[in-house]
């Protein structure tokens, strides 16, 4: 904290430019009036002010508006942004996209901070609900962001937001996450054609049901390997050799290399070695011939 | 990214220094650059600034007419020449440079001692 001391005779700043730069702290503390640095907040981005300096000028402002900072402020605080508080954004009312845009370039390229995260909140919060233009914004800064939120967060996503989608969006998603996206998605891109619905379809598929999966064996969509082994275990599970082979079409030869891992492992232990035999992959594990297969998940819903 | 001041040292009242900031690791033609001085027990303050491009320039009351900043971006250096050296002009020196617009990137800072 500066302790206050009388400005300098000839030293009150009459406008925030760069002489500026060359106060001390506690001169800037004393010779700069907060309601002008309110005004005159968008010169204050284009002033090469050191860390500290910012501190003072954040002060000032914390001062003047101890309930929180009016949008007109916020959407100017450029670097003074890295000086803010998770608790100090908590006060804010942030409701134009470009606010939000504006604060996002201050941090891009770094992770996203506490702060960040606390800004984003407020926004969404303030909307009622993640919308297009939103989402489009905060993937094109943190492209992992939508896996940052939790499958009831997630629920607040209307399907027409998932057209801004990108498939890097979902790379660390997990199958929770998947498993509420991806209703969304089937309903956004339900009036698609064939091919054009699983390019689109096909980054959410880790949360499609079997019954998806077999609809989709039936339209030669040639699903490659990386997207198989994504798959929900349990989805897999129930679809037949055939239904597989048409799933994945000339991919088909890529199960040999995955054998040993999830799903196609689970999977191979479900079919009976003769169906197996049939795609000529020499894939092995599957169930001997003359055996009988029990469903006792069936056996159990029945008693 | 590594700015490194030289120039400093001891000097007669009315004498004459010239620091060096040369950066490593960054080029420097993309940066405002300060430089600033520290003397002891004292606060840090600005002694000059100058713009990416050069075409601005700006200095501390203190040391108008005296000090002048000025860039050479083929050697990835920024200079102070400074002139008429008063006793209150010893501290240490520091440059810093602007990647946005905050002083981002600081040097370890160079000793000057006016006596």
């Known amino acids: 904290e500066v302790e206050k001391t009388a400005c300098p005779s000839g030293k009150k700043a009459r406008e925030i430019d760069e002489s500026l730069i060359f106060y001390k702290k506690w001169e800037l503390e004393a010779c700069v009036d907060a309601a002008l640095l309110a005004t005159q907040m968008d010169r204050v981005n284009a002033i090469p002010f050191t860390y500290e300096q910012l501190d003072v000028l954040k002060h000032k402002l914390d001062e003047l508006y101890p309930q929180g900072y009016p949008e007109s402020v916020i959407q100017h605080l450029g670097y003074l942004f890295l000086k803010m508080s998770p608790e100090d954004i908590r006060k804010w009312n942030v409701t134009s996209l470009e606010t939000l845009k504006a604060l996002l370039e201050v941090n891009k390229g770094h992770e996203m901070s506490p702060q960040v995260a606390t800004l984003i909140d407020r926004f969404v919060k303030g909307r009622g609900q993640l919308d297009k233009d939103t989402l489009d914004t905060l993937t094109a800064f943190y492209p992992g962001y939508l896996c940052s939120l939790s499958p009831e967060e997630l629920s607040s996503v209307p399907p027409s937001s998932i057209w801004a989608v990108r498939p890097q969006d979902l790379d660390t998603c997990d199958p929770r996450q998947l498993d509420v996206l991806y209703p969304k998605a089937r309903l956004a891109f339900q009036n698609m054609n064939g091919s054009e619905y699983f390019v689109k379809i096909q980054s959410f598929l880790g949360g499609a049901p079997t019954e998806d999966l077999k609809a989709l064996s039936q339209q030669n969509v040639s699903m490659d390997l990386a997207t198989f082994m994504k798959l929900r275990t349990d989805a897999v599970l129930p679809l037949t050799v055939a239904e597989v082979q048409k799933l994945l079409g000339p991919h088909v030869e890529g199960l040999k290399a995955e054998e040993r891992h999830r799903p196609v492992r689970d999977w191979i232990l479900r079919q009976r070695q003769d169906d197996l035999d049939t795609l000529g992959l020499g894939l092995q594990g599957g169930i001997p011939n003359g055996y009988l297969v029990l469903d006792l998940s069936m056996q159990e819903a029945l008693s | 990214l590594q700015l490194v001041e030289s120039g400093g040292g001891l000097v007669q009242p009315g004498g004459s220094l010239r620091l060096s900031c040369a950066a490593s690791?960054?080029?420097?033609?993309?940066?405002?650059i300060g430089w600033f001085r520290q003397a002891p027990g004292k606060e840090r303050e600005g002694v000059s600034y100058?713009?990416?491009?050069?075409?601005?320039?700006n200095y501390a009351d203190s040391v108008k007419g005296r000090f002048t900043i000025s860039r050479d971006n083929a050697k990835n250096t920024v200079y102070l020449q400074m002139n008429s050296l008063k006793p209150e002009d010893t501290g240490v020196y520091s440059c810093?440079?602007?990647?946005?617009?905050?002083?981002?990137?600081w040097g370890q800072g160079t000793s000057v001692t006016v006596s």
């Open positions: 100058i713009s990416s491009s050069g075409g601005s320039t």
């Open positions: 690791g960054f080029t420097l033609d993309y940066y405002a």
């Open positions: 810093a440079a602007a990647g946005g617009y905050v002083m981002d990137y």
